[in-house]
């Protein structure tokens, strides 16, 4: 079998699994930050949802016009914030919804810690920690 | 049209303090981080912190944090740098800048303030 | 903190040559595609001004004659043809990691 066909769901559907990356960013406030989806095919549209507590129920996540930018070609989606404050911290997930079928899959989830600035010794340790 | 107007030069004595000043005009003075920038005579540029106007929070080169503390008054656009204990090392000229986001390029600059320190 | 090493410390071109200086990084200063490196010109006296920015793209009212290239480590500055008002001192800045740091600086003298 090919390697996409144990992506594809049982019903046969065309829509695929979607890997998000990276799992973790550590950014420092008023830097930018980019987090990507991708997806075997491009057999649906991608969205955002956003959380900020471990326990919470994502939320679709609200494009700050200027800030937040969503960009999709064949098989890559890509969220770019510019200038992250405090408040942007928290869990970003894609999702993708089939055209031909009901179905949606989410991507695991990108985690933003928004960072004060600090010496490279603070940072070295939190890049060892997220490795 | 764009602009940063720094304060005059500054003449102190070893030990004291000084306080200079940015006025900007011609934009939304909250949208753009503001940099402060140090430049010794006949050297290089040294980045000293950046504060962000719409929430005053600051970010500051480890090597300038107890020498620099910076602020801004939205009400007049103004920014301003304090620098505490002076030596001849801060003898300088001072450079305020903006950028759009904390770590983009800066596009407009004031005019530099000259600080000497001697007794 | 990261070093910018620019070469050479100052070089003397001929009106209407190419003029091409170097800045070497000590670490990469991109960022998921994006170089965070930036060009500024200064003259005596004056402020510095900003002459490329995100190591290739020319700010807007800066001549053609100006270009940027360059990611990673290694990054350059063109000025062709140079032109009398070009003499000055050039400037690399990187802003990818605080403390943004600058470059030592290159005199540009005409011939």
């Known amino acids: 079998a090919r390697s996409e066909d144990r992506y594809r769901n049982p019903k046969g559907s065309a829509c695929s699994r979607i890997w998000q990356s990276p799992r973790f960013i550590a950014r420092k406030r008023g830097f930018t930050v980019k987090m990507h989806c991708y997806m075997n095919s491009a057999s649906g549209n991608v969205s955002w949802l956003w959380k900020q507590e471990m326990d919470e129920n994502p939320q679709q996540l609200k494009l700050e016009k200027g800030r937040m930018e969503e960009s999709q070609n064949e098989s890559l989606a890509t969220l770019t914030i510019q200038g992250i404050r405090f408040e942007d911290n928290g869990i970003y997930f894609c999702q993708q919804k089939c055209n031909n079928t009901s179905e949606v899959y989410q991507g695991c989830g990108t985690e933003l810690r928004v960072m004060g600035f600090s010496t490279l010794a603070q940072l070295k340790q939190r890049n060892t920690l997220k490795d | 049209e764009v602009q940063l107007q720094e304060s005059g030069a500054e003449l102190v004595k070893p030990g004291a303090s000084v306080k200079m000043s940015c006025k900007a005009s011609?934009?939304?003075?909250?949208?753009?981080?503001m940099h402060w920038v140090k430049q010794r005579p006949g050297q290089g540029l040294e980045w000293i912190g950046a504060i962000d106007p719409s929430d005053s929070y600051t970010g500051y080169n480890q090597k300038f944090k107890g020498k620099a503390t910076l602020t801004v008054d939205t009400s007049s656009s103004t920014a301003y740098m304090h620098l505490s204990s002076l030596t001849s090392e801060d003898s300088a000229v001072y450079f305020c800048?903006?950028?759009?986001?904390?770590?983009?390029?800066?596009?407009?600059w004031g005019q530099g303030t000259l600080v000497t320190v001697s007794a | 903190d990261i070093v910018l090493t620019q070469s050479p410390a100052s070089l003397a071109v001929s009106l209407g040559q190419r003029a091409t200086i170097s800045c070497k990084a000590s670490?990469?200063?991109?960022?998921?595609?994006?170089?965070?490196m930036n060009w500024y010109q200064q003259k005596p006296g004056q402020p510095p001004k900003l002459l490329i920015y995100?190591?290739?793209n020319l700010e807007s009212g800066i001549p053609a004659r100006f270009s940027g290239s360059g990611s990673g480590t290694d990054f350059t500055l063109n000025i062709h043809p140079v032109e009398e008002e070009d003499a000055a001192t050039y400037h690399c800045q990187q802003s990818n990691e605080d403390p943004f740091t600058f470059g030592g600086g290159t005199k540009l003298e005409i011939k």
């Open positions: 011609g934009y939304t003075f909250t949208s753009y981080w």
């Open positions: 800048t903006r950028s759009y986001y904390g770590n983009s390029w800066f596009d407009y």
């Open positions: 995100a190591a290739s």
């Open positions: 670490q990469s200063v991109d960022y998921e595609g994006d170089s965070y």
